[in-house]
């Protein structure tokens, strides 16, 4: 869509005559009647297929033609085209004399025409005013055309639609070639895309104008870069949303079970060497001189009676000494200075030489020990301790110090490993002679029913058109990270496309 | 008196150039597109080019396109067509004409001869 | 381009009877035709143009008519003057072109 304009200069009739030659009474009030057509290889008398336009009276005889554009006149004369422009044309101006005020064709006499030109034109769209001179032997015009586009039409045949906008269906101004250029923050065809903050990731980030970062459902940061790990993870990080990859020396679902409860919390004393033996569990190798679970306990070396024929034990810094009695000497007063003439059998023993009388050795009646059977038996020695406890005499008792998971006076009793309920998501624990065993519900397995083998949200592939699916593994739900341009819950829904022309 | 008169006809080796002018008077040449027509021996009328008034649009027939050009002087109301690379079949005889058909003008020369022969 | 076809290529009448012939396009030319007549060593001769409008001089004998793609040169009593060749030519777009001619010669 667009206007020919034609600038109408001057005319010269310098005698007032009209085309037969006859003078004008009293002189030739001159108009004027423009038709303009299609381009004719000959030009030929034929419909005005581009418009039709008539002036009023402009003058008398020979005159000058006033521009009024800016005063909302009809000078430059105005031919609106509702086409592609083609480039050239056929023009024809004619110059009629009236007689009185109707200027109707009708109503003038044929012999009232003074002059006709008949053109065939080439004109680009937005040339300069293109001047043309038409002379007769009797007249002669002056008149200049140009073509523009209408408002919001460009292009070199003003037939590209474009009008500026900022609004939901785009922001943009038209360039002089109908092309759109959009305003700044905008992209796309239409310029209805608007360009993130700088940086922000291109799949989990998004934004609804311009310098805005949004992030998508399982990413967070200033840049949507950063994954969310699964809800309730504690000890663990992610690559991919909803993921809880455990720190080194935690472990489970969640990454809330210490598999390194040695380093985490130091359980062992008295310098006691640490062992991880499984979740929340240890082991202590304690120092010589300590025991107890943790090595807390400081163990007394003259517990084990090593003392011999009745020498008494004294405790030491960096050991034991044994003081002997007469008659004994050695580390544990082993060596005897006596003869069977001394009567060294205590408790009814029996004595016997040896060596020739140099030494000798007592039979000890049943419920005595030693080497002078000066020692009630020791109750420890008959290992009454069960499961590897170890026997400790306190003066004329006896107690068991049992391993980890044994109880009992003499650890016979296993302690219940299921006591700590190990088993995770509702598992049934199972006391077995060396530990324990989880019957794990549907949806899960492993030692302790720690592993979720419940079926993945995402198997079914239920997001459309592309989308990543992540399992949120506390509802067994899935969750659809859409591609840009889809919405809805399973990205379903495609965002309305504008159609060509969207104004 | 109208009259368009051409010149510059003649016998041409194939390959060789000519120009051929057409000199108008009694009418206003720079008002009128301008056109040579040519008629070779024993066949009908054939169109050749066109110049528009001012001389801003030209149109040839394909057959001469890139060797005939067609321009005017409207200072010398004279019209031209500069013949490059003859062939025979360009053998026929050349008018100039002035046809305004809505202005009822219809001009046409006299005609002048051109034969290309070896 | 236009192709115009004349038909008859030659036209036999005798003088003072009426003349028909014909010209067709190949594509509608929207009334830009004219018709010549042509005489052996004379310049075309325009007797119609607009396909029906008669030249300035020309006899009223000689009219045109049609429309679209199809014309018609009628001469109502022919004169021994009329017997030549007569061409219609198509002014709608470039190339030009000519029909091919019809004689008309005295039968």
């Known amino acids: 869509s667009g206007v020919f304009q034609l600038q109408l200069q001057e005319f010269i009739n310098e005698r007032g005559v009209l085309a037969s030659g006859r003078p004008c009474e009293p002189g030739c009030r001159t108009f004027f009647r423009v038709c303009l057509k299609h381009f004719q290889a000959v030009v030929s008398p034929g419909p005005c297929t581009f418009g039709t336009v008539s002036t009023p009276v402009l003058g008398t005889n020979s005159f000058a033609v006033r521009d009024d554009s800016s005063g909302g006149g009809r000078n430059p004369l105005q031919l609106p085209f509702n086409f592609t422009w083609p480039g050239t044309f056929s023009l024809i101006i004619e110059a009629w004399h009236a007689p009185g005020d109707d200027l109707r064709p009708e109503a003038l006499p044929p012999d009232a025409l003074i002059s006709k030109i008949a053109i065939q034109g080439s004109l680009a769209v937005g040339q300069n005013w293109l001047l043309d001179e038409q002379t007769s032997t009797l007249t002669r015009l002056r008149y200049s055309y140009r073509v523009i586009c209408s408002d919001n039409y460009y292009g070199d045949n003003c037939s590209r639609l474009c009008k500026k906008r900022n609004d939901h269906f785009g922001h943009y101004v038209c360039q002089p070639d109908g092309n759109l250029s959009c305003l700044p923050g905008w992209t796309g065809e239409y310029c209805q895309q608007p360009i993130c903050l700088s940086g922000c990731h291109e799949q989990n980030g998004y934004c609804s104008k311009p310098a805005e970062c949004l992030c998508r459902p399982g990413w967070q940061g200033r840049l949507c870069n950063e994954c969310i790990p699964h809800n309730g993870c504690r000890h663990g990080t992610c690559s991919t949303p909803w993921q809880c990859t455990c720190d080194e020396g935690w472990g489970g679902l969640f990454c809330d079970q210490d598999l390194n409860y040695c380093t985490h919390h130091s359980p062992c004393k008295n310098g006691a060497t640490c062992s991880n033996s499984g979740q929340r569990s240890y082991t202590c190798t304690c120092r010589p001189g300590y025991t107890g679970v943790d090595c807390e306990l400081e163990l007394s070396e003259c517990d084990s009676n090593p003392c011999r024929n009745g020498g008494s034990c004294k405790d030491q810094e960096d050991g034991y000494h044994c003081l002997c009695p007469p008659g004994y000497y050695g580390l544990h007063c082993e060596h005897s200075t006596l003869s069977c003439a001394d009567s060294p059998c205590f408790n009814g023993g029996s004595c016997r030489e040896r060596n020739q009388g140099a030494n000798y050795a007592c039979e000890c009646p049943p419920n005595f020990t030693g080497s002078n059977c000066e020692k009630k038996v020791d109750r420890c020695t008959s290992n009454p301790c069960a499961n590897g406890g170890q026997c400790l005499n306190r003066g004329p008792s006896r107690m068991c110090r049992c391993r980890p998971g044994f109880t009992g006076t003499y650890c016979e009793l296993h302690v219940s490993d299921c006591a700590r309920n190990p088993c995770a998501h509702g598992g049934t624990c199972h006391d077995l002679e060396n530990g324990l065993m989880c019957t794990c519900p549907a949806g899960f397995s492993g030692r302790r029913c720690e592993v979720r083998t419940s079926i993945d949200a995402c198997a079914s592939s239920p997001c459309f058109n592309r989308a990543t699916c992540y399992t949120d593994l506390s509802t067994d739900t899935f969750v659809c990270n859409c591609p840009y341009g889809f919405v809805g819950s399973r990205c379903e829904f495609p965002v309305g496309l504008p159609p060509s022309f969207p104004w | 008196e109208v009259q368009l008169v051409e010149s510059g006809g003649g016998v041409v080796q194939p390959g060789r150039s000519l120009r051929l002018s057409c000199a108008a008077s009694g009418f206003t040449f720079s008002n009128y597109g301008m056109y040579w027509v040519r008629q070779a021996p024993g066949k009908g009328l054939e169109w050749v080019a066109f110049i528009s008034h001012g001389g801003g649009i030209t149109y040839y027939r394909d057959s001469v396109k890139g060797r005939f050009t067609i321009s005017r002087d409207n200072s010398k109301n004279t019209l031209y067509l500069q013949m490059n690379s003859l062939r025979a079949e360009d053998t026929a005889v050349y008018y100039c004409a002035a046809l305004n058909w809505e202005l009822g003008i219809d001009y046409w020369g006299q005609g002048t001869m051109v034969t290309v022969s070896s | 381009e236009i192709v115009m076809t004349q038909s008859p290529a030659t036209l036999s009448v005798s003088p003072g009877e009426r003349a028909t012939l014909s010209c067709r396009a190949s594509?509608?030319?929207?009334?830009?035709l004219a018709w010549y007549q042509k005489k052996p060593g004379q310049s075309p001769r325009l007797l119609i143009y607009a396909a029906n409008r008669l030249q300035d001089g020309v006899p009223a004998r000689f009219s045109g008519s049609g429309s679209g793609t199809e014309y018609t040169l009628t001469i109502s009593s022919l004169q021994s003057e009329d017997f030549a060749v007569y061409f219609c030519?198509?002014?709608?777009?470039?190339?030009?072109?000519f029909g091919q001619g019809t004689k008309l010669e005295i039968k």
């Open positions: 030519l198509q002014g709608s777009k470039f190339p030009l072109t």
């Open positions: 594509e509608d030319i929207y009334s830009n």
